[in-house]
Structures are given as C-alpha cells and as structure tokens.
Amino acid sequence: MKVLQEPTCVSDYMSISTCEWKMGGPTNCSAELRLLYQLVFQSSETHTCVPENNGGVGCVCHLLMDDVVSMDNYTLDLWAGQQLLWKGSFKPSEHVKPRAPGNLTVHTNVSDTVLLTWSNPYPPDNYLYNDLTYAVNIWNENDLADSRIHNVTYLKPTLRIPASTLKSGISYRARVRAWAQHYNTTWSEWSPSTKWYNSYREPFEQR
C-alpha cells in the first residue's frame, strides 16, 4: 500500500482541519487507514482520525482540534495497520481555509434594488470575524455565460445591486464565499446557492 499524493491540510482556524490525500490504488480508507495527529509540545495526547473515501483512490479526514490557536503545530502520521505510510507536520494558522458563509438571502422588496445578505461564519470573538472579505457570484439560470462576480471588500456581509443590471423576467442564482486577508487564506467553499426571480421592469419612459 502506497501514498500517491501526500496529505495536504487546511484549517478553519477554529476547531476543524481537513486533510486530503490520494492512494496508489483503490482503497477502503475507513477500514484500512488511520491518520494520527498530535500537538507538538511536551507529551501531548495523540488523536486518531478515521478517513472517508473521496473518490476511488482519494481519502479525506476531518481532524477535530481543541480550539486552534496560532502557536499550534501538529505532527501527522498516516498508518495502514502497523505500517507507517507517511509522516508530516501541519501548522493550522498557516493553512487557513475559512468556513463558508451561510444564510444567503435575497431581498427584492425594494423595487429597483436587489439586496443580498449572508452571515459571517465566525463568532465576533474570532479574529477572522473582522478579517473576511467576500466574493458573490450571480448567474442567470438559463444562460451560464451570463455570470458575474462582485467583490465585497467591506466588512458588512451585504451586497446591493441595481435590479436594472439584471435581465427582466429571468431567474437568477447567487452564492458567496470568503477569504481572510491578513492570513492570506485560500477561498472558502461556496455557500449553498439561493434563487430569485427578477421581476424588475424599466420605467415606461426609459423603454
């Protein structure tokens, strides 16, 4: 049994880190493999993660960590029974992938404006709460070429767009993702998308 692509890990900088890797052939990850992780300091407790399959040769493990802080560094050992397949280390604060924003809602009750709001995925006491910026993807359900990205670089998780910039009588979808500038993170996953119908019609004299 061999590791084809070594584990790479990202942290939500709260309590969960996710490691992914690829094996040399089809593997029942949960039955055959274990990922052991231990905080690098004195004789800290060793934790075990049972991986799941992620495609035929891919494995993924969700490591539960007790309140990740900047000083934390973990050793990672990938075992197949008594055989050590790979050994590495992981510093969560240097590999941050923010949690995805949630509760994306579209408000169309203001006649000429589409207001999108969503929730910051972090509590206010977490540094990332005030460090996130967002990208909002809006697309036409019937024409995937009609897609745009709005970068939200201010702190408030809202976006206002003129309804007139969207085609009338068309269903649109939106989704949002986040990244943290000070930590130079990767982008989060996209939030679940939300759908709305653009019923805006230009005033008669502008037609």
């Epitope: 900088y13 709260m14 905080l39 690098v40 300091f41 800290s44 407790e45 007790d66 309140d67 990740v68 802080v69 900047s70 000083m71 934390d72 560094n73 240097e94 509590p123 006491d125 977490n126 540094y127 990332l128 000070h182």
Partner: antibody, heavy 121, light 107 residues
C-alpha cells in the same frame, strides 16, 4: 469591560502547595484560551501555563510541568492554578491573562492585577 | 524553544526623541510578535500585536515593524508617560516566550 481578578497568593514554605484563582467577567469566558504568566521580583515575564477554551488541552512551561495544574470552571467563569512542591524560585507575581481573540493564545489584551506568591522558609 | 533577545537592555532618551527597541527571534516567527509596556508597579499592557497592529487605545506614536526574525518597536516622540519596561513576546510556537525586557528611562 473585561475584568480578571486573581486571588490565593501568599507565603508558603518550600514543598508546600497553593491554589490560585482568577475570577473573570466582561467576556464569554468559555470561548477563550486562558493563561498564567509570572514575574519574579525585579525580573522579566515568564509564561507558566495555558488551558484551551474547552479545557481539553493544557500546556505548561518545563519549569513547572508535573508540579502545577491549570484548570477552569466555565460555569463559574473561573481559572485555577494548583501549585504543588513549591520552590523558592516560584516566588513571583502571578498574572491571569486573556488573549485579544478566541483563536489567539499569546496576544494578551487583558491582564489581572496579579497575586503575589512567596516561597520561603 | 524560540529565544527572544531584546536590545538594548536599557536606554535613556530625551522627551520628544524617536526611540527604537529591537527584538530578535532565534528562528522565523513570521509576524507572530507582540509588544508590551509595563510601568512600575503595574501589570503589563499590550501595545502591538501581529508584529505591527496597534492595540485599541494605544497612542499612534507607538508602531511596530518587522517579520521573520527581526522586529522593531518605535516610539516616534517620547513622552514622560512612556517611562516603562518594554517586552516582546512570540506566539508562533509553544512554549510562548518573552524577551528579557528593555528599560526605558527619561533623560
């Protein structure tokens, strides 16, 4: 506003024990890693111990490991430091400290006023 | 363990002077560095975190710079109330370590 109030210091003989307490208010106690830092008379600052928010991880300086035990009671908003087998070199002001953010552990934005521990025969 | 070395150990400066204190880490700590001010008989106070971020309520004459192994705390115009001992501290890896301190006196 954040308040940290240490208590439990005093004079103790070498080999003796003390339990320090830190009563906290003004923030969500259970969300933060909390730390004890000490300062010997006329000396600099020394990290002693940290306990993470949920209490599952405790970390100690080599100088106190196996003698001191950090703990917390999230229901009572109180941090503790049980000090056993005390030595003269443990004589110091002990500060209870809180980081700025819940995912920080070392940027101490809030400090208690300190409690003095004197180990002497 | 990461050793933090401050220089100078003490310094004397005049009111209005620009004062710089340096802190050297024994290995790279990225920007995980904080600066504290401790006045006689008081608990320390956080001035700078993340190497250069000014803590709320701290006068703008204080600034921090540097990354990797070399860091600087600058006081742009020294005031009487700045008489204190200054400490750097790394929070890059366990155990958390402080510099030995720099005592600032007013000429």
């Amino acid at each position: 506003q954040v308040q940290l109030q240490e208590s439990g210091g005093g004079l103790v003989q070498p080999g003796g024990s003390l339990r320090l307490s830190c009563a906290a208010s003004g923030f969500t106690f259970s969300s933060y890693s909390l730390t004890w830092v000490r300062q010997a008379p006329g000396k600099g600052l020394e990290w002693v111990s940290t306990i993470k928010a949920r209490g599952g991880t405790t970390l100690y300086a080599d100088s106190v490991k196996d003698r001191f035990t950090i703990s917390r009671d999230n229901a009572k908003n109180t941090l503790y430091l049980l000090m056993n087998s005390l030595k003269p070199e443990d004589t110091a002001v002990y500060y209870c400290v809180k980081p700025l953010y819940s995912n920080f552990a070392g940027d101490f934005g809030s400090w208690g006023q300190g409690t003095t521990v004197t180990v002497s025969s | 363990d990461i050793q933090m070395t401050q220089s100078p150990s003490s310094l004397s400066a005049s009111l209005g002077d620009r004062v710089t204190i340096t802190c050297q880490a024994s290995q790279s700590i990225s920007s995980y560095l904080a600066w504290y001010q401790q006045k006689p008989g008081q608990a320390p106070r956080l001035l700078i975190y993340g190497g250069s971020r000014l803590q709320t309520g701290v006068p703008s004459r204080f600034s921090g710079s540097g990354s990797g192994t070399s860091f600087t705390l600058t006081i742009s115009g020294l005031e009487t109330e700045d008489l204190a001992t200054y400490y750097c501290q790394q929070d890059y890896s366990w155990p958390l370590t402080f510099g030995q301190g720099t005592k600032l006196e007013i000429k």
